[in-house]
């Protein structure tokens, strides 16, 4: 079998809402993946599991099941949304995200995604991790790749 390539493209959109009294930020983050099937037979994308971290804390998780199949030597672009909540120990971010004196309220989030594919009863998992900028101060639609957080700026693991 040839490889199945998973490429995390980036954040497509981020829709934000706030709970004023509980100083909570709700961010619905839609991400885009490219999955390429380099084989001469179809493969099933069985599930996508994703999580988002802020300051080493998981703030959102999502799982998509029975997503699609990808034909031989074909590629599919898949969008998936992770609902995230920034609250409680991180409620200090509420002030930053709602501060009207600044235009862009970028925060750095770590996107983690695992794609499970199956073919002929065989299962394969491919994972990706990427740091991304997301504006927590307004609803934003991004050009693909626009929200990328440069590797040189990534904190050491």
């Amino acid at each position: 079998p040839r490889s199945i390539d998973v490429k995390y493209i980036g954040v497509k959109s981020a829709y934000v809402s706030y709970d004023v009294q509980k100083r909570t930020i709700y961010l619905n983050i839609t991400n885009t993946l490219n999955i390429t099937n380099n084989n001469y037979y179809s493969v099933e994308v069985e599930n996508i599991t994703a999580q988002v971290q802020f300051a080493k804390t998981v703030i959102g998780k999502a799982r998509l099941n029975n997503i699609t199949h990808i034909g031989p030597l074909d590629m599919k672009q898949i969008d998936y949304t992770v609902p995230t909540v920034i609250a409680e120990e991180m409620s200090y971010m509420y002030d930053f995200c709602t501060l009207i004196s600044i235009k862009v309220h970028n925060i750095v989030l770590m996107m983690q995604v695992t794609v499970t594919t199956t073919y002929f009863g065989h299962s394969e998992q491919i994972s990706q991790e990427r740091y991304q900028y997301v504006d927590c101060g307004r609803n934003t639609t991004y050009q693909l790749g626009q929200s990328e957080y440069l590797n040189v700026l990534q904190p050491q693991q």
Epitope: S17, Y18, D19, V20, Q21, K22, Y26, E88, E89, I100
Partner: antibody, heavy 121, light 112 residues
Framework: QVQLQQSGAELAKPGASVKLSCKAS????????MHWVKQRPGQGLEWIGY????????KNNQKFKDKVTLTADKSSSTAYMQLSSLTYEDSAVYYC??????????????WGTGTTVTVSS | DIVMTQAAPSVPVTPGESVSISCRSS???????????SYWFLQRPGQSPQLLIY???NLASGVPDRFSGSGSGTAFTLRISRVEAEDVGVYYC?????????FGGGTKLEIK
């Protein structure tokens, strides 16, 4: 129907600790934050803090940060407030209050019966 | 901390008449989302407080429509029309916008 049943009156000596309870019934305990409010005899109301029963996260009024410990037990749907190093100023009625509502529209919709704490030597 | 001030410690009223109880906040409770986070509670003698008004002007469930709330960002009024004997007690305003949440000192409604 939604109810908050608080523990009985406490008589304690200065320097001692007491643990008050607030048992919730008639709703999903983990869905709403539980707040605590103090009322000294013949005086007004003072917000102490809250516990989120779902996560255990608490936030206290700075005035009470060294005085009060808030906890919640999901299995018994009970919120607790421990008062430590009691002084005469801690003599008061303590209420638990559920914060009902929805996003950006929260309010103290249900109050407990109140627990009287008397500090006396 | 936001200070809530109820200037009148008590207000006397005759049953059947109307009465207004006022409260001021040291900071505006009007949020940019359009909501004003002021609240009114009644504590009857020997009882726990009960919610009357939330977000300045919204009547809480089960509260008679004789009660109404109004105001601006920093000045709030609770109005009771056709006062009844069961309305006696202490009325507290509260701000539910910023920690620590704070209450006014209370206004006692007394029947003449």
């Amino acid at each position: 129907q939604v109810q908050l049943q608080q523990s009985g009156a406490e008589l304690a000596k200065p320097g001692a600790s007491v643990k008050l309870s607030c048992k919730a019934s008639g709703y999903t305990f983990t869905s709403y934050w539980m707040h605590w409010v103090k009322q000294r005899p013949g005086q007004g109301l003072e917000w102490i803090g809250y516990v989120n029963p779902s996560s255990g996260y608490t936030k206290n009024n700075q005035k009470f940060k060294d005085k009060v410990t808030l906890t919640a037990d999901k299995s018994s749907s009970t919120a607790y407030m421990q008062l430590s190093s009691l002084t005469y100023e801690d003599s008061a009625v303590y209420y638990c209050a559920r914060e009902g509502g929805s996003i950006s529209d929260w309010y103290f919709d249900v109050w407990g019966t109140g627990t009287t704490v008397t500090v006396s030597s | 901390d936001i200070v809530m001030t109820q200037a009148a410690p008590s207000v006397p009223v005759t049953p059947g008449e109307s009465v207004s109880i006022s409260c001021r906040s040291s900071k505006s409770l009007l949020h940019s989302n359009g909501n004003t986070y002021s609240y009114w509670f009644l504590q009857r003698p020997g009882q726990s407080p009960q919610l009357l008004i939330y977000r300045m002007s919204n009547l809480a469930s089960g509260v008679p429509d004789r009660f109404s709330g109004s105001g601006s960002g920093t000045a709030f009024t609770l109005r009771i029309s056709r006062v009844e004997a069961e309305d006696v007690g202490v009325y507290y305003c509260m701000q539910h916008l910023e920690y620590p949440y704070t209450f006014g000192g209370g206004t006692k409604l007394e029947i003449k």
